[in-house]
Interface confidence: medium
């Protein structure tokens, strides 16, 4: 039996700049029941606070609701492990919420096969920003990528679309079924996971409808 091993805060993420969660790896428990507490201070403040919510985001996590989240302050976060033989503290993590944004994927992905006047067909891909992001006010500037592949292909073909929420894909093979996904990234954050997969078959004999 021994004091607990040093815990490690391994991830902090915010979906929207309004809330965030940090998760930690406990380290060894020294063979004894071990309690973990996350404490934080904010830059320029003397006070130290304990995690406001250990439950919402699951085991070994701390959730900071709107009430506890500020993008104007740096959070200095540590996790403390304690058992009856002693205690151990993680290295501090300096968290600027604006840097840890990982949004939900774009929504309402729609796929449509269209035809130009010269009979050339293309796939028109459209989507909407994730629900929680306030793109219109400039609070978020969102960039997007789409990826597609035919059912038979091993590799995805990725297209960066900038701030556009639509994209036209040319040179697709008739008779093939294509899978499409989108993802997004805020100005200073990280790419969302790829969104729900949609599929569409490119017709062999596409005729333009009125």
């Amino acid at each position: 039996q021994s004091p607990p091993g040093k815990p490690e805060i391994h991830k902090c993420r915010s979906p929207d700049k309004e809330t965030f969660t940090c998760w930690w790896n406990p380290g060894s428990d020294g063979g004894l029941p071990t309690n973990y507490s996350l404490t934080y201070s904010k830059e320029g403040e003397k006070n130290t606070y304990e995690c406001p919510d250990y439950k919402t985001s699951g085991p070994n996590s701390c959730f900071f609701s709107k009430q506890y989240t500020s993008i104007w302050k740096i959070y200095i976060i540590t996790v403390n492990a304690t058992n009856e033989m002693g205690s151990s503290t993680s290295d501090p993590l300096y968290v600027d919420v604006t840097y840890i944004v990982e949004p939900e994927p774009p929504r309402n992905l729609t796929l449509e096969v269209k035809q130009l006047k010269d009979k050339k067909t293309y796939l028109w891909v459209k989507w909407l920003p994730p629900t929680i992001t306030d793109v219109k006010t400039g609070w978020f500037t969102m960039e997007y990528e789409i990826r597609l592949k035919s059912e038979e292909a091993d590799e995805w073909e990725i297209h960066f679309t900038g701030h556009q929420t639509q994209f036209k894909v040319f040179d697709l093979y008739p008779g093939q079924k294509y899978l499409v996904q989108t993802r997004c990234k805020p100005d200073h954050g990280y790419w969302s996971r790829w969104g729900q997969e949609k599929s569409i078959e490119i017709p062999n004999d596409f005729t333009l409808k009125d």
Epitope: I71, Y94, Y99
Partner: antibody
Framework: QVQLQQSGPGLVAPSQSLSITCTVS????????VNWVRQPPGKGLEWLGI???????NYNSALMSRLSISKDNSKSQVFLKMNSLQTDDTAMYYC??????????????WGQGTLVTVSA | DIVMTQTPLSLPVSLGDQASISCRSS???????????LEWYLQKPGQSPKLLIY???NRFSGVPDRFSGSGSGTDFTLKISRVEAEDLGVYYC?????????FGGGTKLELK
């Protein structure tokens, strides 16, 4: 504890390229950005560029065409490559880790520096 | 690119004096997220630079409280309340708000 260890050649011939490796310990490259900064002898500091936790890069616009920053997360190594060196590229080259988790500036931890002399 | 201008170039002091270094940016360095990423570094001869202050006024861990930063918009100041021998060296301001990030030219704090 956090450490950044640099290795690279001390002497580079004009028009040749430079490669410096920054090997880090005490933190993961998937959680912190690493910057490169240089300092010509007797002069001030110049920011060269950054590779972020997610692998995205930003460069000093004046050097962008000659500069490339990459990394190998599994080996905890960050690489600086610079092409077409001239005598005015003679400098001490530093790698430096960001203070903020997933952040960029605030160079809290620095390598020891690699002195690069460009000379025939 | 944003130009960071430091004054004075050289600052002769006596130990125990108060020292003040000014840094002015050629345009506002308020980031699009509302924060101001203005930093101060100290470099002693033959050493790598060290972070003193981040986000205008926040001391990095281990930095003595005789160091303080202030300012907003385009005008920023680093103050040392009572200069000690270990404070001598070259001080650099730095903006990390707008790429390409830029350093000031440096201010040498030296004994009179």
């Amino acid at each position: 504890q956090v450490q950044l260890q640099q290795s690279g050649p001390g002497l580079v011939a004009p028009s040749q390229s430079l490669s410096i490796t920054c090997t880090v310990s005490g933190f993961s490259l998937t959680s912190y950005g690493v910057n490169w900064v240089r300092q010509p002898p007797g002069k001030g500091l110049e920011w060269l560029g950054i590779i972020g936790a997610g692998g995205s890069t930003n460069y000093n616009s004046a050097l962008m065409s000659r500069l490339s920053i990459s990394k190998d997360n599994s080996k905890s190594q960050v690489f600086l490559k610079m092409n077409s060196l001239q005598t005015d590229d003679t400098a001490m080259y530093y790698c430096a880790r960001s203070l903020y988790y997933y952040g960029s500036s605030s160079f809290a931890y620095w390598g020891q520096g690699t002195l690069v002399t460009v000379s025939a | 690119d944003i130009v960071m201008t430091q004054t004075p170039l050289s600052l002769p002091v006596s130990l125990g004096d108060q020292a003040s270094i000014s840094c002015r940016s050629s345009q506002s360095i308020v980031h699009s997220n509302g924060n101001t990423y203005l930093e101060w570094y100290l470099q002693k001869p033959g050493q790598s630079p060290k972070l003193l202050i981040y986000k205008v006024s926040n001391r990095f861990s281990g930095v003595p409280d005789r160091f303080s930063g202030s300012g907003s918009g385009t005008d920023f100041t680093l103050k040392i309340s009572r200069v000690e021998a270990e404070d001598l060296g070259v001080y650099y301001c730095f903006q990390g708000s707008h790429v390409p990030w830029t350093f000031g030219g440096g201010t040498k704090l030296e004994l009179k």
